[in-house]
């Protein structure tokens, strides 16, 4: 790496999680740098020979990236004078999951920070009466998940039952062979009550709620993604 | 400003080997947040990637043309070329080079493109 | 390797009048997928990259956007200039791929 500077700087990374498919980001900051063209950024990951990303000069060098992120990455140009030095990464695969180094070179000194990166599937589930069903029952979607979620479902007046027997959740694999359309069904639901519908996978949890009374249906999902920050 | 210019013969005979080359002007072909790609359109079709190089060598060629391309670059004469060999008929197309960018990958700017006819 | 669908193939607009080209994928590639515009005997233009973002020195009258597998480039009111043959790109993954263009036409 040969780096330059007497002083150790703070540099400081946040484990996150990629979504499979859709375009994610490994965050890292450092100590702020007025002089473009004295900053180095090197983005490195665990096992792979080669760099993820180089920026340096005030400008990308990829000639020593690895051919698994080519194309693929880029930092935020117009703010690493602002000690931003996180990566943007397209079209996260199940491979870039790891551990990853973020080295900072500055005008004030050197130093790196290590982020583990996780990678799956994750999405808001929906939740729909079903109006097909011989009793009044609840269909909750949700289109893409990997690893294999858990699925529970809870209910505001039956606060602590086990619905575990009055579900049925399936997995459907999807096209590209990796990530899962998870369906849950809830039977025998009453009117004037709300039902969650809760995902979970050691990388995110998402929950759908649905209110059904005699004149109208009220929704709401969340997603929040495990085990996030420095 | 950045400009881009395709040379080259312009007509090949079947089973032989296209060779064209691109001029970069108004920049350095080794400023590093780009390929340098190629792209073909044959007579009143659509357009088709055919791969792309950094400036330090590195090519990632379209997979249905891999076996029949190579992409080099003179970084000296802020050069790069496309060979295609065994060509056909198939291959008669508009020749366009263009730089890329290395996230996001659009095409920006295009050279005015080049028309090579395989005939014999 | 990832299709691109361009609909219509023909689009016949007046001037001043809006149009509405759509372009569809395959399968998701998220908001990358740019635009461009070709005129007879000339190269393509970028008009819009990242589903949305106009290049530089375009009208504001192209605007793009989309996301996933549906996407969507409406030009507010067409100048004459804008009669030409629109391209989608997706560059989510190699090989990066073209739709088939969409033709606007003067009607």
């Known amino acids: 790496f040969g780096i330059s500077g007497k002083h150790f700087i703070t540099v400081t990374t946040f484990t996150s999680a990629g979504n499979i498919g859709e375009d994610g980001t490994l965050s890292c900051t450092f100590e702020p740098d007025i002089k473009l063209n004295g900053i180095v950024i090197q983005w490195l990951k665990e096992g792979i020979k080669g760099l993820v990303h180089e920026f340096k000069e005030g400008k990308d060098d990829l000639s020593q990236q690895h051919e698994m992120f080519r194309g693929r990455t880029a930092v935020f140009a117009d703010q690493v004078v602002v000690g931003n030095a996180s990566l943007r990464l397209k079209n996260v695969q199940l491979t870039d999951a790891g551990t990853y180094t973020c080295y900072i070179r500055t005008s004030k000194g050197k130093g790196n920070a290590n982020l583990e990166y996780k990678t799956g599937a994750f999405s808001m589930p929906e939740i729909n009466v079903d109006y097909n069903a011989s009793s009044e029952s609840l269909r909750c979607e949700a289109p893409r998940w990997f690893p294999q979620p858990t699925v529970a479902w809870a209910s505001q007046v039956d606060q602590g039952a086990n619905f575990s027997e009055v579900s049925n959740t399936s997995f459907e694999l999807n096209s590209e062979n990796v990530t899962m359309k998870v369906v849950s069904v809830l039977y025998n639901v009453t009117i004037n009550n709300t039902y969650s519908c809760m995902i979970e996978n050691d990388i995110a949890k998402a929950t759908g709620d649905i209110k059904v009374t005699d004149s109208e249906v009220k929704r709401r999902s969340q997603l929040q993604l495990l085990n996030s920050g420095p | 400003q950045l400009q881009l210019q395709e040379s080259g013969p312009g007509l090949v005979k079947p089973s032989e080997t296209l060779s064209l080359t691109c001029t970069v002007s108004?920049?350095?072909?080794?400023?590093?947040?780009?390929?340098w790609g190629w792209i073909r359109q044959p007579p009143g079709k659509g357009l088709e990637w055919i791969g792309n190089?950094?400036?330090?060598?590195?090519?990632y060629y379209n997979p249905s043309l891999r076996s029949r391309v190579t992409i080099s670059v003179d970084t000296s004469k802020n050069q790069f070329s496309l060979k295609l060999s065994s060509v056909t008929a198939a291959d008669t197309a508009v020749y366009y080079c263009?730089?890329?960018?290395?996230?996001?990958?659009?095409?920006?700017?295009w050279g005015q493109g080049t028309l090579v006819t395989v005939s014999s | 390797e990832i299709v691109m669908t361009q609909s219509p193939a023909t689009l016949s607009v007046s001037p001043g009048e809006r149009a509405t080209l759509s372009c569809r994928a395959s399968q998701s590639v998220s908001s990358n997928l740019a635009w461009y515009q070709q005129k007879p005997g000339q190269a393509p233009r970028l008009l819009i990259y990242g589903a949305s973002t106009r290049a530089t020195g375009i009208p504001a009258r192209f605007s793009g956007s989309g996301s996933g597998t549906e996407f969507t480039l409406t030009i507010s009111s067409l100048q004459s200039e804008d009669f030409a043959v629109y391209y989608c790109q997706q560059y989510h993954s190699f090989p990066f791929t073209f739709g088939g263009g969409t033709k606007v036409e003067i009607k």
């Open positions: 108004g920049g350095s072909i080794k400023s590093g947040s780009y390929y």
């Open positions: 263009a730089r890329e960018g290395s996230y996001p990958n659009q095409f920006d700017p």
């Open positions: 190089i950094y400036y330090s060598g590195s090519t």
